[in-house]
Every structure is written in structure tokens, then in C-alpha cells.
Interface confidence: low
């Protein structure tokens, strides 16, 4: 008789999760010289220790502290790019603008990007069938707590001018319930961060509206201003041209508005 196991509403742990994390760690440390000292087996052991044998609705930031310690990384604090609901373009941008970093350009973000994982209380098994959904099951699940923890630390590290890429095609361009809106905005340090500059990415080719006037952007401006951080906003009307001009800033067409 198969042992009863909890059925959650979300997808189960990503196939070959341990192998994927270990392989990503090895590749990351080989690409990034400042992280070459990292022992990837220890990283995996710490990652595993954060959720294995624990109830997947009862995970805390404390569970991830051993992993956070091993993955401690110095990124240039004035080169941080946050994003909300527009991950692909943000990553394309940092692939071209190599001196800027999203969370997924750091070791811990890179390890977990697009992966799902959870365990089961009192067993050493990884649950490949289902994992808790943030809305339908519980918010303190292994994946959500991980991203909350690394996002908080990433925002706390930021200084000078911090950029955020926002999706202008969504009904809520700034969403207070997103990781950016609920975690990162509130963990920017006013004594270190001078300005938050929002880049609102337009979806439609003929969309010439000033989305910086959107009510949700005004809400973001209000939250940021109350935290004694300056706010600025730019429309990126043509994301394709924007990326092209980052690649080739000398191009004559790049002097006009993008």
C-alpha cells in the first residue's frame, strides 16, 4: 500500500533538482572568479538542510541562513537592477550591460531561478509530486521564503542609484503584492540609496502614452518618497531598440528617445 502523502496545489519539485543545483553552482563559480572559493557540495548540503524533513508550510528565513552565509557575495552596490513581472528583458539587459546585476546574476539567484522544491515533514524525501502554492496553500513554503530572503538581502545591499524594470503592459505596473513591491521596496536603505529609477517597459509598438503618470507608479513614488529616497521614472517605448542601443550606444539612432 503506497504511503499517504500530502497533495499540494502547486507543481512538485523540479526534476533532477539536486543535480541541477549542484551543476549550476559549479558552472557559476567557474564563470565568476570572485566566487571560485565556494564549495558547491557544501552549498547543496546547506540548501537541502533548509527544507528537507521540514513541513513545507513552516519554513522560515532562519532555515536558509546557512545557505545565505555560504552564498555571501559582493556585487557592486550601485549596479543593481531590480525587476517586476519582466524578468526576461531584465536578464537580456544584464547579459549585454555586464556590469549591472539582477538577483538572478548572483550565485543564490542563479541556483534557484525557475526551479521549484519542497520536502516532507519527518522524511528525508524530496516531494516531486506537488509543492505548496503561495496563494492556495501557504506563503511560508520553501520557494517563497527563499525568494523573500534573498530579495531582502539584495535590496539591503543596494546603494546610490537603484534601477527597477517594470512591465508597462500589466494592469498594475507597480504591484504592491509582487516581490519588488512587498519586499525589495521596503528594504532599500535610505542612508545608502539616493534614488530609485523606474524603467517602464512599453509593450505595444504604437503605445506613446506616458506610463510614468500611471496611478500605480504614483503610488510607488509616494512609498519611495516617504522612505526619504528620491524617485525618477523613464518610459522605454521600444524595448527592442533599447537593448540594441545598450549593445551599440554609438549608433546614430540611439540619440533619440527609446
Amino acid at each position: 500500500v503506497p504511503r499517504w502523502r500530502q497533495q499540494w496545489s502547486g507543481p512538485g519539485t523540479t526534476k533532477r533538482f539536486p543535480e541541477t543545483v549542484l551543476a549550476r553552482c559549479v558552472k557559476y563559480t567557474e564563470i565568476h572568479p570572485e566566487m571560485r572559493h565556494v564549495d558547491c557540495q557544501s552549498v547543496w548540503d546547506a540548501f537541502k538542510g533548509a527544507f528537507i524533513s521540514k513541513h513545507p508550510c513552516n519554513i522560515t528565513e532562519e532555515d536558509y541562513q546557512p545557505l545565505m552565509k555560504l552564498g555571501t557575495q559582493t556585487v557592486p552596490c550601485n549596479k543593481i537592477l531590480l525587476w517586476s513581472r519582466i524578468k526576461d528583458l531584465a536578464h537580456q539587459f544584464t547579459q549585454v550591460q555586464r556590469d549591472m546585476f539582477t538577483l538572478e546574476d548572483t550565485l543564490l539567484g542563479y541556483l534557484a531561478d525557475d526551479l521549484t522544491w519542497c520536502g516532507e515533514f519527518n522524511t528525508s524525501k524530496i516531494n516531486y509530486q506537488s509543492c505548496p502554492d503561495w496563494r492556495k496553500d501557504c506563503s511560508n513554503n520553501p520557494v517563497s521564503v527563499f525568494w523573500k530572503t534573498v530579495s531582502r538581502r539584495f535590496a539591503e545591499a543596494a546603494c546610490d542609484v537603484v534601477h527597477v524594470m517594470l512591465n508597462g503592459s500589466r494592469s498594475k505596473i507597480f504591484d504592491k503584492n509582487s516581490t519588488f513591491g512587498s519586499v525589495e521596496v521596503h528594504n532599500l536603505q535610505p542612508e545608502k540609496v539616493q534614488t530609485l529609477e523606474a524603467w517602464v517597459i512599453h509593450g505595444g509598438r504604437e503605445d506613446s502614452r506616458d506610463l510614468c503618470q500611471d496611478p500605480t507608479i504614483k503610488e510607488l513614488e509616494s512609498i519611495i518618497s516617504k522612505r526619504n529616497i528620491q524617485f525618477s521614472c523613464k518610459n522605454i517605448y521600444r524595448p527592442d531598440k533599447f537593448l540594441q542601443c545598450v549593445k551599440n550606444p554609438e549608433d546614430s539612432s540611439c540619440t533619440s528617445e527609446i
Partner: antibody
Framework: QVQLVESGGGLVQPGGSLRLSCAAS????????MNWVRQAPGKGLEWVSY????????YYADSVKGRFTISRDNSKNTLYLQMNSLRAEDTAVYYC??????????WGQGTLVTVSS | DIELTQPPSVSVAPGQTARISCSGD??????VSWYQQKPGQAPVLVIY???KRPSGIPERFSGSNSGNTATLTISGTQAEDEADYYC???????????FGGGTKLTVL
């Protein structure tokens, strides 16, 4: 186009010093980590040293540690290799190479260093 | 540090497939690149990230890496492919770059 040009090679006596330069053009120099790789006559490639784009991290092969120093001047788009206490076994063609990810995508033509009395 | 071992020489008839191996302890967990070097010239990158080809490198060049062995494969070998080939990887613990000893490819 993207180019790396080495200079500064020549004949030097054992125990002597030499400074190699590598002038970069056609790309944003400070965005890339750089390396020195050498090749003794008739032998294979041997990695010598690495420097991060911002200049803050350096690595050396055990064979040159403590004798060679890699540095860069991003304002001049130039990479350097200061070689002290040179030995006969340091005789080689020295290449500078641009690092992209984990591979060297652009190489200079090399400069010959001969250590002999 | 990891040691990369290559055969000193490989011979192939024109139009045939040449395979050059590069072995090292658990090499499949690391990333391997391959370089071609012709006499009197600087090395040229032909394969990176195990199996990716830079622009300008002919499709007949391909790579694989698993277990303890990485392999550079040249299908339909041409006379102009005659050169020395070097594999390269990293030892991230020490921060050092490692090259294989090189393989001389002769097109008969």
C-alpha cells in the same frame, strides 16, 4: 574591429625583469576580464595569470606566483604583465587573451620573451 | 588542480571524421573550451561551453562533455583543419585555468 596587440618582449638575462603590455581596441575594455597565456617553443599553451574587469581580483599559475604581477589601466585600455626574477623556463611567446565567461574569445598575436645569458 | 590529458596526435583522411579527446577527473561537471592553433599563429576559439560554436566557425566542428571525457569532433575534415588543438577548463578551487597538452591533427 576587436583587437589585442602585445608589446615589450625581448631578450633578457636570467634574474632580470621585463614588462609586457597589451593594447586593446574595438570593445569596452573594462567590461572584460583579461588573461596572459604563454607558449614555450615547440610546447603547449600554459595559462599564466588572470585579472578581473575592474582590476580587483587577480590569479596566478603556481609557476609564476610571487614573481609576476598582472595589472590593467582601464583608462588606457591596456593590460600589463610585470615579470621579475626571470628564469630560462619563462622563455615563451606571451599572449594576452580576452575572457568571455569561461573561455578566451579574442587573442593577441603574441610577443616573444627570451631569457638567456 | 585538474589535469587534462589529450592524445599527442590524431590522423584522419580528408572527408572523414576526426575525434580528439580530452580527459580529466569528473571533467563533465566542468565547462570545456577548444582552441585551434596553426603554426606561427595565435590560438582561435572553436568550441566553448562544451558544445557551442562561435560565429565564423564551420558547422563541422562540434563538442561534447560528459563523465571524465570531453570530445572535439570534426566531421568531413578538410586539409585546412590540420593544426594543433587544445582543450581548456577551470579549477575553481584555486582560480586557475588549465589547458590540455595539445593534439596535433594531421589530415592525410
Amino acid at each position: 574591429q576587436v583587437q589585442l596587440v602585445e608589446s615589450g618582449g625581448g631578450l633578457v638575462q636570467p634574474g632580470g625583469s621585463l614588462r609586457l603590455s597589451c593594447a586593446a581596441s574595438g570593445f569596452t575594455f573594462s567590461n572584460y576580464s583579461m588573461n596572459w597565456v604563454r607558449q614555450a617553443p615547440g610546447k603547449g599553451l600554459e595559462w599564466v595569470s588572470y585579472i578581473y574587469g575592474g582590476g580587483s581580483y587577480t590569479y596566478y599559475a603556481d609557476s609564476v606566483k610571487g614573481r609576476f604581477t598582472i595589472s590593467r589601466d582601464n583608462s588606457k585600455n591596456t593590460l600589463y604583465l610585470q615579470m621579475n626574477s626571470l628564469r630560462a623556463e619563462d622563455t615563451a611567446v606571451y599572449y594576452c587573451a580576452r575572457q568571455a565567461g569561461m573561455y578566451f574569445d579574442v587573442w593577441g598575436q603574441g610577443t616573444l620573451v627570451t631569457v638567456s645569458s | 588542480d585538474i589535469e587534462l590529458t589529450q592524445p599527442p596526435s590524431v590522423s584522419v583522411a580528408p572527408g572523414q571524421t576526426a575525434r580528439i579527446s580530452c580527459s580529466g577527473d569528473n571533467l563533465g561537471s566542468k565547462v570545456v573550451s577548444w582552441y585551434q592553433q596553426k603554426p606561427g599563429q595565435a590560438p582561435v576559439l572553436v568550441i566553448y561551453y562544451d558544445n557551442k560554436r562561435p560565429s565564423g566557425i564551420p558547422e563541422r566542428f562540434s563538442g561534447s562533455n560528459s563523465g571524465n571525457t570531453a570530445t572535439l569532433t570534426i566531421s568531413g575534415t578538410q586539409a585546412e583543419d590540420e593544426a594543433d588543438y587544445y582543450c581548456q577548463s577551470y579549477t575553481f578551487e584555486s582560480g586557475s585555468v588549465v589547458f590540455g597538452g595539445g593534439t596535433k591533427l594531421t589530415v592525410l
